[in-house]
Interface confidence: low
């Protein structure tokens, strides 16, 4: 019997698969590369093109740059010869490996081009505020694609000592649920660092100003973050859901959580930041649904409810 | 103050369908979930199921499943339970109540008595 | 389900004495995270809804007087009226709200002597 060749193991003819592709997000800083990745298997060996927005993209004609695209391979390297060449490449990127069997298609590969963090030049009134009541010094970033680091110092570059009290909020705010006379200093500064471009910048320093009084007022608690009862956030399955809550008062009031459907998943859950932010670890299905914090002092309570909707990554 | 607001009694023949309502006023319509309650002339209470009214996400007592349809309309705030193919057993008082999660029930209606009767 | 089982069915007391009475539950109703038992009792007047008087097993809602309180842990608590009033007369009733579905008891009908 004679076996036809194609009919061979080593031969068998398989359609595109992709093996290798960069990830649906992209963030590149000026100084940066621009890297794409798509890595495909088949027989016979397949061939890759790009689409940028729909429209197809071929890297090797881009001019100005220097393009350096791997044999065999739909992955390719872009170096610019300017600090800004990156923003010219934003867009969405797909690639399509194809051969007689068919073609295979990447996701959807958005890249964003971050320009160099500047804080926008301000001038920063004093804050004035009684002892005892609350006050949020804001941070305010230039935004970002990319997640960023806040920290609050002093002009000694002494971090600002956070507790129940005072604490930095996931927005870079720095938020008091009361002020104490110690807290007068005129130089609290928020410091923004981009990990991508190895760049802090910093804020013009904040004068707060406290005003002594005879007798601190008690008061219930409000929710200085989120101000509204309740907010519908959308949670991507094995990724993981910061929630938060900030609250003032006198005296401090404390953070409390609660999943009203019943228990919180112990084994994934942590909380941070003296209770205000509750950190949950690769959201799955059954982490849909709502999550309460509660605030509480001796006078009273306030609380937020989050509904939360868990969706495909 | 929260108000929730159910219709009085409802006669209804075997077989037939009805739907109660629970109008809710004094609070953020859709901030708090909303319960239902069945409890049979002289009998304990047992727990039906409950609707987020933001999303309309429900949770129903298994034993209730195939009887009862939780719905709600945001526009007036108000919340609906369809009750089907009644028979006697269905015969009971129903409530809303508001649950937020840490208070447990603290809010309720005054209750519908459903008679089924032919 | 949870199964939640009261008892007694039904008691008589005097005015001005102590009253208890007990609920168990088929499992824990503590959630070791927050240290707070899911579990509320309400009363039930005749022709009225029921009324929250105490949440977290311990906890009593603003407006019910202090002399009713509840304690207990895990599957096993108590609601106590400390004196007992003419008012007091109704069904109590205990309720879990950890895991679906919510479950109640079958009830203690409490009067006087």
């Known amino acids: 019997i004679q076996i036809p060749e194609e009919y061979e193991g080593h031969h068998v003819m398989e359609p595109p698969v992709i093996t290798e592709q960069s990830p649906r997000r992209l963030v590149v800083f000026p100084t940066d590369d621009i890297s794409l990745k798509c890595e495909a298997s088949g027989k016979p060996e397949v061939q890759f093109r790009w689409t940028r927005d729909g429209v197809h993209f071929k890297p090797k004609e881009e001019l100005g740059v220097t393009v350096y695209q791997s044999p065999h391979s739909g992955s390719f390297t872009i170096t610019g010869n300017n600090s800004n060449f990156a923003q010219r490449f934003q867009g969405i990127y797909r690639c399509f490996a194809s051969n007689k069997l068919g073609t295979a298609m990447s996701h959807e590969i958005r890249l964003m081009a971050e320009g160099a963090p500047k804080w926008p030049k301000e001038t920063v009134k004093p804050v004035e505020v009684e002892e005892g009541e609350s006050v949020v010094l804001p941070c305010n970033p230039p935004p970002s694609a990319e997640p960023l680091r806040i920290y609050w110092m002093n002009s000694k570059i002494l971090h600002i000592k956070q507790d129940e009290r005072v604490t930095m909020g996931q927005n870079g705010n720095l938020y008091f649920a009361n002020v104490l006379t110690s807290d007068n200093h005129s130089d609290y500064i928020c410091h923004a660092h981009f990990p991508g471009t190895r760049t802090i910048i910093q804020k013009e320093p904040i004068d707060l100003r406290v005003k002594a009084t005879n007798s601190m007022i008690d008061r219930k608690p409000r929710l200085l973050f989120p101000t509204n009862s309740s907010s519908h956030l959308v949670a991507l399955q094995g990724q993981p859901l910061v929630l938060e809550c900030i609250a003032e008062g006198f005296p401090t009031p404390t953070i409390k959580w609660l999943r009203p459907s019943g228990p919180m998943p112990a084994d994934r859950v942590t909380y941070q930041n003296h209770n205000k932010t509750l950190q949950l670890l690769k959201v799955g299905e059954e982490d849909d649904g709502e999550y309460r914090c509660l605030a509480e002092n001796s006078l009273g309570s306030a609380r937020h409810a989050y509904y939360v909707t868990v969706e495909a990554a | 103050q929260v108000q929730l607001v159910q219709p009085g009694d409802e006669l209804v023949k075997p077989g037939a369908s009805v739907k109660l309502s629970c109008k809710a006023s004094?609070?953020?319509?859709?901030?708090?979930?909303m319960q239902w309650v069945k409890q049979r002339p002289g009998q304990g209470l047992e727990w039906i199921g409950e609707?987020?009214?933001?999303?309309?996400?429900?949770n129903y007592n298994e034993m209730f499943k195939s009887k009862a349809v939780l719905s709600v309309d945001k526009s007036v705030s108000t919340a609906y339970m369809q009750l089907s193919s009644l028979t006697a057993e269905d015969t009971a008082v129903y409530y809303c109540?508001?649950?937020?999660?840490?208070?447990?029930?603290?809010?309720w209606g005054q209750g519908t008595l459903v008679t089924v009767s032919s | 389900d949870i199964v939640m089982t009261q008892s007694p069915d039904s008691l008589a007391v005097s005015l001005g004495e102590r009253v208890t009475m007990n609920c168990k539950s088929s499992?824990?109703?503590?959630?070791?995270?927050?240290?707070?038992?899911?579990l509320a009792w309400y009363q039930q007047k005749p022709g009225q809804p029921p009324k929250l008087l105490i949440y977290?097993?311990?906890t009593r809602e603003s407006g019910v007087p202090d002399r009713f309180s509840g304690s207990g842990s895990g599957t096993d608590f108590t609601l106590t009226i400390s004196s007992l009033q003419a008012e007091d007369v109704a069904l109590y009733y205990c309720?879990?709200?950890?895991?679906?579905?919510?479950?109640f008891g079958q009830g203690t009908k409490l009067e006087i002597k």
């Open positions: 109540a508001l649950y937020d999660g840490y208070y447990a029930m603290d809010y």
């Open positions: 609707i987020n009214p933001s999303n309309g996400r429900t």
């Open positions: 977290w097993a311990s």
């Open positions: 309720q879990q709200y950890h895991s679906y579905p919510f479950t």
């Open positions: 004094g609070y953020t319509f859709t901030s708090y979930w």
């Open positions: 499992q824990s109703l503590l959630y070791s995270s927050n240290q707070k038992n899911y």
